[in-house]
């Protein structure tokens, strides 16, 4: 007869591992024992338990609770045992030392791998503004064993780098993502993607990229200025600007307080019916906690008594 | 005073595409990201996805393979389309403006202003 | 089955407070900022809260909010009926399903 196990049993922390042990034998033949030990090199052997056909399962003090039989039906030649709730220390080699009658002992190794599935974290960088070079976005550290994969995923343009950590059981792998923050990168998500063997599937995390900017300011309303005339009802002057985070407007009057009756209504400004008084320079003031920016334009409110000469020139020229 | 309001078909048939849009009034699009959400009769709230003004986009993963939210810059509105609808895609959908900034230690994320949502019935 | 865990209804009588919780974890509450959403039955949800405890304008100083770890509450002192309402709890959520995740809701009704 001979021996059939595996020479590697690979289990996920805190799983149960199944140390496979079966003698094939003829007919005829009986198990009447199997011991298994533990028998890393450099080390004496440490026996775990012993499976006796007459009198059952004897754990040893130091796997109490840990090491079972498998569920029946069980095959009287079948000596495989279960250890349940496998740790990173349990990772190693272990022998089966099979008696048999009338045959004798038949023994054989296998290696217990224990894989140690990461837990990624993501740390993004400091904030991201218009203008810096190039900056860390985010890194993401995950500690496995064996050592896990770290990527990135995204449309964003950058560059990344990793280091790696051995300990004695496991290792740990960092990866940077850095890059030239721009404006066309908000809202972009950047994900960290860890694979491990001890993983169904990968892990990701993602950090939605912000980058802080304000755009120049520019007023949109004086493009006709022969529309600013006493009387006209409904004239407006807009601020136009960009930013993240998006940005307040304010407005004032350069030559001094706002006329009564503008009203103020956040990136507009509402005349009341044009008089003199509402020619002026106004001043919008755009800001965020980034930057601030101000734009100013002149208004010249016309009289068309004062026009009328000229306009009639101009007609009868024409 | 900005205000949103949702448009679009209150009925689309299986396997079909609904497609809302959102027009914002009273303000600029610019600078804002702007969201869908949407909530089944007598359920929670569910993030569909955002749109950034500039055009970039993040969809909820469990929608992903069926959304397009698109913005026009021009005309102050956005739109969500959702392909290959079912019964439970009978929801009340809402546009809405987030908030969204991260201040390098977490995220700064509302949504502050929203539309009356429509109500959209999948059924042949 | 919502991210973030609410408790489905609470209630008191009116002039008394109530609290609501919102629970979740480290890729979500943990991290970031939460907001809270006040709902009535066949209208839009309007921000109640913002930045884990800002109020908007309008908001009146009876609604407070406060975050703890990987857990959130909504205060709501000096009951009036007008508050019966569905209130929802929001944050980002970075992890697998990388999203801005809701609460269940939960129902106020004020005795």
């Known amino acids: 007869g001979e021996l059939e196990t595996s020479d590697v049993v690979t289990v996920v922390l805190g799983q149960d591992a199944k140390l496979p042990c079966f003698y094939r034998g003829d007919s005829g033949e009986q198990v009447g024992q199997v011991a298994w030990a533990r028998v890393d090199a450099g080390e004496g052997a440490q026996e775990l338990a012993l499976l006796h056909s007459k009198y059952g399962l004897h754990v040893s003090p130091a796997y109490e609770g840990r090491v079972e039989q498998p569920p029946p039906p069980r095959n009287p030649l079948d000596g495989s045992v279960l250890l349940r709730n496998a740790v990173q220390a349990d990772e190693g080699e272990y022998e089966c030392r099979v008696s048999t009658f009338p045959a004798g002992s038949f023994q054989a190794r296998l290696r217990l791998r224990v894989l140690v599935p990461p837990l990624p974290s993501l740390n993004p960088g400091p904030a991201l503004e218009e203008g810096q070079g190039l900056t860390l976005a985010a890194s993401c550290t995950a500690e496995g064993s064996p050592a896990p994969s770290v990527t990135w995923d995204t449309e964003v343009k950058g560059t990344t780098s990793s280091r790696s950590f051995k300990h004695s059981r496991s290792a740990a792998v960092t990866s940077e993502f850095h890059l030239v923050p721009s404006r066309s990168m908000n809202g972009q998500p950047l994900t960290c993607v860890v694979s491990h063997p001890g993983l169904l599937q990968d892990q990701r995390i993602t950090h939605i990229l912000h980058v802080s900017f304000l755009a120049e300011a520019s007023v949109r309303g004086l493009e006709d200025q022969n529309l600013w005339h006493i009387g006209r009802e409904g004239a407006m002057l807009k601020c136009l600007s960009e930013g993240q985070p998006p940005p307040s407007y304010n407005w004032t009057r350069l030559d001094g307080p706002l006329p009564s009756g503008v009203r103020v209504d956040g990136d507009t400004l509402g005349f009341p019916p044009l008089t003199t008084e509402h020619s002026g320079i106004y001043v919008c003031h755009v800001s965020n906690e980034f930057s601030s920016r101000d734009s100013q334009v002149t208004v010249d409110v016309l009289d068309p008594q004062e026009d009328s000469g000229k306009q009639v020139d101009l007609v009868s020229a024409s | 005073q900005v205000q949103l309001q949702e448009s679009g078909p209150g009925l689309v048939k299986p396997s079909e595409t609904l497609s809302l849009t959102c027009t914002v009034s009273?303000?600029?699009?610019?600078?804002?990201?702007w969201s869908w959400i949407r909530q089944p009769p007598g359920k929670g709230l569910e993030w569909i996805g955002y749109?950034?003004?500039?055009?970039?986009?993040n969809y909820n993963p469990s929608l992903k393979s069926r959304v397009t939210i698109s913005v026009d810059m021009s005309k102050n509105q956005f739109s969500l389309r959702l392909s290959s609808v079912t019964a439970a895609d009978t929801a009340v959908y809402y546009c809405a403006r987030d908030f969204h900034h991260y201040d390098g230690s977490a995220y700064r994320w509302y949504f502050d202003l929203w539309g009356r949502g429509t109500l959209v019935t999948v059924s042949s | 089955q919502s991210v973030l865990t609410q408790p489905p209804s609470v209630s008191a009588a009116p002039g008394q407070k109530v609290t609501i919780s919102c629970s979740g974890s480290s890729s979500n509450i943990g991290n970031n900022y939460v907001s809270w959403y006040q709902q009535f039955p066949g209208t839009a949800p309007k921000l109640l809260i913002y930045d884990n405890n800002k109020r908007p304008s309008g908001i009146p100083d009876r609604f407070s909010g406060s975050k703890s770890g990987t857990s959130a509450t909504l205060g709501i002192t000096g009951l009036q009926t007008g508050d019966e309402a569905d209130y929802y709890c929001g944050t980002w959520d970075s992890s697998l399903n990388a999203g801005w995740v809701f609460g269940g809701g939960t129902k106020l009704t004020v005795l």
């Open positions: 749109i950034y003004y500039s055009g970039n986009t």
């Open positions: 009273g303000g600029s699009i610019s600078s804002y990201f």
